[in-house]
């Protein structure tokens, strides 16, 4: 339905709270590097012109499209070209490759200072004294560290950040309260940002086909009474939705994630039994709490699959008819009998079906050459649950820190040629894998641990897109979104690596280290591992645990000396030579 | 919209001829193998014929080998069934499949064969 002015509709859809906040998050996410005082100057002119286009939608400039808009308003800003550089040509486009501009240029990794906690005081003085621009300030912050972070989820974010200062800052024991929650919203931020950056990844680089069947796979694990078609209606929405906040459409993003969790919870009889407690929420919690909903029940007489997508001999009569629609219910039917499995390794199944099929299809005798084609299932299956049986079991004796250090070893023997920083950002993420998958039971495994590997092998993904240096990590990257994870597993150690020259420098620590947190200081001697690695890559494990356990007694005894300075100047030089000797550096 | 279209049937004096034609559409007709089946009065579907997306591979029913010959042509996108030595038991509606469907989708073309 097409509206006059498309800016009135939207801010009448939203209201002016919402309508400035995502107005924010948008310019922030896109101009990542502009002060917090410059995008509220834009974002309160952009509001005022959007209140004259509901007074008159006839009004000038009011029938503009919202790039155009939006655009135009980013391109006033005065330091784009020496802020920004290339950037500042995209202004010189017109929509819609000027809107594309702006999007090739968003900054998975800005060069923006580490966001540090100010003392609870402080910041709840800041609270109360302004609380409209603290919270924007919040808004502002996360956009522009999380270019792709999904925009109605971040309005969700600041409506509890703003729960915890208004309750933790009026009690006794302010820290107490506050600290855990914020650290809470720290790390599902983080997540969220990352699954997010994996929907838009899936949708930009593998297209609209690929996302759809990641949402025909998840729903019909999520909703398995649902039917086919009704399943069909909600991944159409939910890939509207995602396809328009990440393309930088939040205004829209926004307005249809309401108009759908609208919908679902009209009609939640006929999609799942356990969307009641959601759809009793208001509408931010609400779309994060259906988001997140468990899987519903599986229906207790579903029949054999075989029937209809091997033992009929209409199969290739119905590929033929419809051919994404037929592997959409072939999807659909075998991931609502799969909750056990993950989505990456359902779709796997779907394009194994589909690559027969199309083997099959052209024979003369298609029935025979397909019989036998959920055989080919069994490998495919087994080896996500073998790999998850072992690392389990590897986490399990290791704990979580010796787990992560155990990865990092691998993953840098893998691709040496990563930069040290992310080696160490996402191996650290990979070792997460085991305290938050390994406690579920074996049906829940599977869908924990592959899932969230995907997402975090996406950030190593999109981190090393903006400088390639690995032939390796590209090809597993970019060839197959669903065979990520089993491409990254398979490579073994770089042969051709040349090793990197031996640098004191990098081995060298100071007193400062004895006041960081415990994060930060497995952060530092995590460092130290991937370039002992970089160094030595045909180091054994024997050998790395050697150095690691004597640096982390160096650390130790170093932080309880008198002299902490003197002592990691002296003992440093020592742990240094006897580590060289140790590997033969 | 798949569709399958037959003509080309009639009635014949036993050991006439007849080539059945099958022009399709929608759908990539060279990347699938094809049928011809038959159903006569009162009976149920019988697969006659099959031959697959390159034209290579051609399978028939015992009750018809040596007499009938199945081809396609990928360009025009049409299959056939040239029916030499018929037979009075070879009356029936002939119908063309996708694969090795034996469920009619189509209006077939009716083959007598009649003295």
């Known amino acids: 339905d097409a509206h006059k002015s498309e800016v009135a509709h939207r801010f009448k859809d939203l209201g002016e709270e919402n309508f400035k906040a995502l107005v924010l998050i948008a310019f922030a996410q896109y101009l990542q590097q502009c002060p917090f005082e410059d995008h509220v100057k834009l974002v309160n002119e952009v509001t005022e012109f959007a209140k004259t286009c509901v007074a008159d939608e006839s009004a000038e400039n009011c029938d503009k499209s919202l790039h155009t808009l939006f655009g135009d308003k980013l391109c006033t800003v005065a330091t784009l070209r020496e802020t920004y550089g290339e950037m500042a040509d995209c202004c010189a486009k017109q929509e819609p490759e000027r809107n594309e501009c702006f999007l090739q240029h968003k900054d998975d990794n800005p060069n923006l200072p580490r966001l540090v906690r100010p003392e609870v005081d402080v910041m709840c003085t800041a609270f109360h004294d302004n609380e409209e621009t603290f919270l924007k300030k919040y808004l502002y912050e996360i956009a522009r560290r999380h270019p792709y972070f999904y925009a109605p989820e971040l309005l969700f974010f600041a409506k509890r950040y703003k729960a915890a200062f208004t309750e933790c800052c009026q009690a006794a024991d302010k820290a107490a309260c506050l600290l855990p929650k914020l650290d809470e919203l720290r790390d599902e931020g983080k997540a969220s940002s990352a699954k997010q950056r994996l929907k838009c990844a899936s949708l930009q680089k593998f297209g609209e086909r690929a996302f759809k069947a990641w949402a025909v796979a998840r729903l019909s694990q999520r909703f398995p009474k649902a039917e086919f078609a009704e399943v069909s209606k909600l991944v159409t929405d939910l890939t509207k939705v995602h396809t328009e906040c990440c393309h930088g459409d939040l205004l829209e993003c926004a307005d249809d994630r309401a108009d759908l969790a609208k919908y679902i919870c009209e009609n939640q009889d006929s999609i799942s039994s356990k969307l009641k407690e959601c759809c009793e929420k208001p509408l931010l919690e609400k779309s994060h709490c259906i988001a997140e909903v468990e899987n519903d029940e599986m229906p207790a007489d579903l029949p054999s699959l075989a029937a209809d997508f091997v033992e009929s001999k209409d199969v290739c009569k119905n590929y033929a008819e419809a051919k994404d629609v037929f592997l959409g219910m072939f999807l659909y039917e075998y991931a609502r009998r799969h909750p056990d499995y993950s989505v990456v390794l359902l779709l796997r199944l779907a394009k194994t079906y589909e690559t027969t099929l199309e083997k099959c299809c052209a024979a003369a005798d298609p029935h025979e050459c397909y019989a036998k084609v959920f055989d080919e299932f069994k490998p495919l299956v087994e080896e996500p649950q073998n790999l998850i049986k072992q690392n389990c079991e590897l986490f399990e004796q290791l704990g979580e820190y010796k787990f992560q250090n155990a990865l990092l070893v691998r993953y840098t023997k893998k691709v040496p040629q990563v930069s040290t920083p992310t080696l160490v950002e996402v191996s650290r993420n990979l070792g997460k894998v085991g305290s938050k998958c390994c406690k579920h039971p074996e049906a829940k495994r599977m869908p924990c641990a592959e899932d969230y590997l995907s997402v975090v092998l996406n950030q190593l993904c999109v981190l090393h897109e903006k400088t390639p240096v690995s032939d390796r990590v590209t090809k597993c990257c970019t060839e197959s979104l669903v065979n990520r994870r089993p491409c990254f597993s398979a490579l073994e150690v770089d042969e051709t690596y040349v090793p990197k020259e031996f640098n004191a420098e990098t081995f060298t620590f100071h007193a400062d280290i004895c006041t960081l947190s415990e994060k930060e200081r497995q952060i530092k001697k995590q460092t130290a591992l991937v370039e002992l690695v970089k160094h030595k890559p045909k180091a054994t494990k024997e050998q790395l645990k050697a150095v690691m356990d004597d640096f982390a007694a160096f650390v130790e005894k170093c932080c309880k000396a008198d002299d902490k300075e003197t002592c990691f100047a002296e003992e440093g030089k020592k742990l240094v030579a006897a580590s060289q000797a140790a590997l033969g550096l | 919209q798949v569709q399958l279209v037959e003509s080309g049937g009639g009635l014949v004096q036993p050991g006439g001829s007849l080539r059945l034609s099958c022009a399709a559409s929608g759908f990539t007709f060279g990347s699938f193998g094809m049928s011809w089946v038959r159903q006569a009065p009162g009976k149920g579907p019988e697969w006659v014929s099959a031959i697959d997306g390159g034209g290579a591979d051609t399978r028939y029913a015992e009750s018809v080998k040596g007499r009938f010959t199945i081809s396609r042509d990928n360009a025009k996108k049409t299959l056939y069934l040239q029916m030499n030595s018929l037979k009075p038991e070879d009356t029936a509606v002939y119908y063309c499949?996708?694969?090795?469907?034996?469920?009619?989708g189509s209006q077939g073309t009716q083959v007598t064969v009649s003295s």
């Open positions: 499949t996708i694969g090795g469907s034996t469920s009619r």
